[in-house]
Every structure is written in C-alpha cells, then in structure tokens.
Amino acid sequence: EVEKTACPSGKKAREIDESLIFYKKWELEACVDAALLATQMDRVNAIPFTYEQLDVLKHKLDELYPQGYPESVIQHLGYLFLKMSPEDIRKWNVTSLETLKALLEVNKGHEMSPQVATLIDRFVKGRGQLDKDTLDTLTAFYPGYLCSLSPEELSSVPPSSIWAVRPQDLDTCDPRQLDVLYPKARLAFQNMNGSEYFVKIQSFLGGAPTEDLKALSQQNVSMDLATFMKLRTDAVLPLTVAEVQKLLGPHVEGLKAEERHRPVRDWILRQRQDDLDTLGLGLQG
C-alpha cells in the first residue's frame, strides 16, 4: 500500500476538473493539493464526484483548515455539507445569509439534522439576534423552526421579525413559547385595524392574558374553536359566559363537543349553571 501514497507520474491535478472523477480514492488524496481545492471550491459542485470521493475532499479541507473552514470555502460546500459533523460546524463563522441558504438547500426535504441545527445556532449567535431576513429564511426551510427555540432564545426575536411568521410556523409551539411570542406579536401588529389585527394575532393567542381576551370579545372576532382550545387555561377561566359567547360568536355551539377537554372543561366548572343555560347547549357545570 505504501507506493500508493505518491501521486503517479502525470496525474498531479493542475485544476479541479471533471478528469478527477476517474481518480481512485488514494489518487485523489495523493494528487490534489488542498490549497488548490480551497481556491477552486466553486468548481466542486460542477463535477460529479462520487459520494465516496466527497470524503477525500473533506479530509483535504480538514487538514488545510484544522481550526475551521473560512466562509469563502463554506459557501461553496454544496453536498459536501452532508459530510460535516456538528463538531466541524462549531468551528465555523458563518455571517452571510446567502451561505446559510445554500447549505440549507442541500438539506431541503428533511427534518432539521444536528448539523443544520448547529449551523443555524452558529449563524444566529454571530448575528446577535434573529432578524427578519434570517427568520424568513429559516421558517421557509423549516416551518417548525421557531418552536424549536427555548423561551430564552425567543426573547431575542425582535417584534419586527414577527411579520415573517406564518400560522403553520407556530403549530408545535408550547404555551411557554407563545407567552414570549405573544407580546412581540401584539407590538408588531398594534397599528392594524380590528379584523386585520385578529387575523394576524390569532396564531399567537395561546400566549394572551385574560384582559386581552376580554378586549377581543368586544370586537366581534368570531374566534374558531381550534384557536379557543389553544388558549391558556388560566386566561380563559376568568371570562364570563357572555364574554365567551361574544368571543366565539357563531362558533359558540362548538363548546358542547369540547366540554370534556381543557380549557372548556375547567371554564364550565367555574360558571354558574344559570349563566351556562343561557347558551342553550346543555352544558353542565
């Protein structure tokens, strides 16, 4: 095996081109200079290297940049990104949104891998906060991204970024996360008129306090049952029967089907039977 470590005569790579796909693994290792590879990374994705050959290219870059790759290399990794470990990525300093997008594209169609999670973490920490463009990008690739963040991490989301959030982005958020996001959304949408405001704020209402729900009940919003069921129990309990009736509008009839589930169950138990009877739904307190 020893003689294989030297590059065969006439095989030394002068540039990164298609001829390299016919090199055996050991020839690629012996005949491609790491510095040449780094300067011509933009060509790598144009060449149908085998999945095996990608391992060799990564090894070369690792030797050249033991402290982590520069962004000029990272932005051209393409499918080589699939070969990176979270440990590799922790050494990177990624500042360009275009670089982030290019690497996320490679992982498209999959759940967030540990590699992607590490990449995003490095990027966001480098930026200092989750700005609107970043959030736009991340939620486009990973609708559940926002709900993967801790309440502490969410606290760094500026209210202006909330405009990028779509209802499906909040599907997997728990109450603690919505507690952080709701005040930001309220601030972001504060200048909108009643009906438009409700459309925007609806997905965030799982973090709304009682007083805000009381205020909404005065605005003929006709909240659907799915949204009502996601409200905080402690925020729903103080609402009167009249307020819930106004809040739900024509959807109030849906309470009967949900009478055994929280928060409806707990709310019913707090009401006077006379008041519940006014709804005509047969709810028993």
Partner: antibody, heavy 116, light 107 residues
Framework: EVQLVESGGGLVQPGGSLRLSCAAS????GNWTIHWVRQAPGKGLE????????????LYADSVKGRFTISADTSKNTAYLQMNSLRAEDTAVYYC?????????WGQGTLVTVSS | DIQMTQSPSSLSASVGDRVTITCRAS??????VAWYQQKPGKAPKLLID???RLYSGVPSRFSGSGSGTDFTLTISSLQPEDFATYYC?????????FGQGTKVEIK
C-alpha cells in the same frame, strides 16, 4: 409543486431510435442533477444515465454507453434521453428523476417497447 | 459496480406487524444508502437517504439503520398503505445501483 413529466415512449423496432423528454416544473433543472432510471416489465430498477447541473457532465450505465445520450435544455426546463440502436432488452418503463445522489422526485414514467 | 442484495425477495405480513427488510452491499458504502417504496403502476417514492434520514412527509414508522455493508429498513407497525415493493439504492460510487426489491404482501 415539483413535477416531472416524461413523454416520447412507444413501440420501436430493434436498431431503431427514440427520444424521451422529461419536462420539469416547480424547480429549475439547471440547479439539479437529472437521472434516467428504467424498469423492465416485472423487474427491478436500473439506473441508466445522469446529467450534472452546473457543468452538463454526463455519466452512463455500461449497458447503454455509446447508444444513449442524455442532455438538457435549461431554457425549456427539459431533459432528454436520445436512445439509438435499441435492443429488445431496452424494453422498459423509463423514469426521469431529480436528485444528486438519491432521487427525491420521479416522473410517472413512459413505456418503451422494442420489438419487431 | 457495487452489488446490492436485498432479502427477502417477498414477505407476507399483517397490519400492525413489525417488518424488517435487509440489504447487503458487495463493499463498504458507509452511509451512502437510500430506500424507496413503489406501488404497482406508480413511480418509486423516496423514504430514506443517508442510511437513516427520513424524507419529508414519510411517516415515522419507517426507519433506516445499518453500517458499512449491511442495511435495514424497518416498518414498526405495518399499515394498509404500506403494502408495496421496497428498493434499496447505493450512491457511494457510480453507477448508482439498486437492490432487486422486496415485495410486502398482505398475509
């Protein structure tokens, strides 16, 4: 929505030629590797050829090398498979598929029958 | 070329069963393996790539595992819509090659 639609299949005599088309929508073929994969009646999958996006580089299975040519027209967002010197053993449903190493989207396939 | 040998070639199972399909590569292919599902008259659908990565929209009852030359596709609880033919594929080296398929039939 990503879609691949093959066309151009049919009955052809041994030694004859056919050109299959793969019209893509919902993505730009200039950014993706396109593969042709075939499946003989009642048999398994056999990879035929690929065209690499950025460079237009092509690779072929030994069984079709020198007879088949894969190409792409980015302005039409369409890939092609030119099949010459067809043999009975080339009879199969031909699928085009997208993806660099694995294939995440496939067309519905077009049947090529080589028979006298 | 790298050969991919699938076993069994067919199996009969009932709804709710745990099903395991194996694929053996003729040489080490690291994690360069994908799995597909194909129903009669339809194109294959990607289930798993990089040996273990579940593709978007694929139910979590499907999982992939393995190392080097031996790979497994597991369906933890077979559903009626899972009766189909399954193929493994290696993409470690060109040409990419497929296993001969495993047909999962209703018992």
């Amino acid at each position: 929505e990503v879609q691949l639609v093959e066309s151009g299949g049919g009955l052809v005599q041994p030694g004859g030629s056919l050109r299959l088309s793969c019209a893509a929508s919902g993505f730009t073929i200039g950014n993706w590797t396109i593969h042709w994969v075939r499946q003989a009646p009642g048999k398994g999958l056999e990879w035929v050829a690929l065209i690499w996006p950025e460079s237009g580089a092509t690779l072929y299975a030994d069984s079709v090398k020198g007879r088949f040519t894969i190409s792409a027209d980015t302005s039409k967002n369409t890939a092609y498979l030119q099949m010459n010197s067809l043999r009975a053993e080339d009879t199969a449903v031909y699928y085009c598929a997208r993806g660099r190493y694995w294939m995440d989207y496939w067309g519905q396939g077009t049947l090529v029958t080589v028979s006298s | 070329d790298i050969q991919m040998t699938q076993s069994p070639s067919s199996l009969s199972a009932s709804v709710g069963d745990r099903v395991t399909i194996t694929c053996r590569a003729s040489q080490d292919v690291r994690d360069g393996v994908a799995w597909y599902q194909q129903k009669p008259g339809k194109a294959p659908k990607l289930l798993i790539d990089q040996m273990v990565r579940l593709y978007s929209g694929v139910p979590s009852r499907f999982s992939g595992s393995g190392s080097g030359t031996d790979f497994t596709l597991t369906i933890s609880s077979l559903q009626p819509e899972d009766f189909a033919t399954y193929y493994c594929q290696q993409y470690f080296n060109w040409p990419v090659t497929f296993g001969q398929g495993t047909k999962v039939e209703i018992k």
